[in-house]
């Protein structure tokens, strides 16, 4: 079975800068899975942001600002990366990755 690890416990960024969050997949080939990214703001329900499927298709939640989030995967390191552009107060949250095995 696949296993996920987010090596960064926390990430502190200056306003308007770019944040990159990593999710390392083990126990399964990343190219045979879909990786989903979610965020949970304090006091709010968890929210789907973006996913990258086994075939590389990217799906973004409607209502999420365009250009705010970018998702990628690096098969060599079995890692999925969530990039958050122009970090703002509204981006302060806990970010989770999740796996769906094909």
């Amino acid at each position: 079975a696949g296993h996920l690890e987010q090596p960064q416990i926390s990430s502190t960024k200056t306003l308007s800068k770019t944040a990159r969050l990593e999710c390392v997949v083990s126990g399964i080939t990343i190219s045979a899975t879909s990786v989903y990214w979610y965020r949970e703001r304090p006091g709010e329900v968890i929210q789907f942001l973006v996913s990258i499927s086994y075939d590389g298709t990217v799906r973004k939640e409607s209502g999420i600002p365009s250009g705010k989030f970018e998702v990628d995967r690096i098969p060599e390191t079995s890692t999925s990366t969530l990039t958050i552009h122009n970090v703002e107060k509204q981006d302060i949250a806990t970010y989770y990755c999740a796996l769906w095995e094909v």
Partner: antibody, heavy 124, light 109 residues
Amino acid sequence: EVQLVESGGGLVKPGGSLRLSCAASGFTFNSYDMNWVRQAPGKGLEWVSSISSSSSYIYYADSVKGRCTISRDNARNSLYLQMNSLRAEDTAIYYCARDRGIGGDYYSYAMDVWGQGTMVTVSS
Amino acid sequence: EIVLTQSPGTLSLSPGERATLSCRASQSVSSSYLAWYQQKPGQAPRLLIYGASSRATGIPDRFSGSGSGTDFTLTISRLEPEDFAVYYCQQYGSSPPYTFGQGTKLEIK
């Protein structure tokens, strides 16, 4: 001194348009989310619209959605509210207000600096 | 949409007395997202309390906020003449971001 100064209010006929402006000074404008709040004569406060520091997140009250557009120019330290298809019920004092930012408890959202407001009257 | 209901609508007290103002939410509100404002006639609102219980800069310690979930309270321990005004609670949420209560008018008895 931290200051917000609104302008652009006035008398307009129903169906008309107005553009409100808010000039900010005394703080790093591009680090703060900003808001418009209105108050009809003799009534309570009503949130109208919000915009995040880099303009990624924009929200509107249902009462103005589709008729108002919030924007900001961080280079000019200015906040705007374009109001179209104005109605009598839009008559109010419009306040520009700053979110308290990310110092200290950055999870809290509240409006810590307010302008004195600009009056918008919609009447034929 | 979360609805905030303030009570009482009007509170008549004398200087030196204790004022207790209530704000009830139609559903649970994160304490981090509850604020109180004071507004005097002809003036813009002034932030008193944020995060349900933290006093804003320059606010006297006779003002205090408390509560969690759906019930929040603003207490003024000993009323001064300048405290007579209208008080609003406000919440920040996800849809829409902000809602205000209808206000409580604190008047001199």
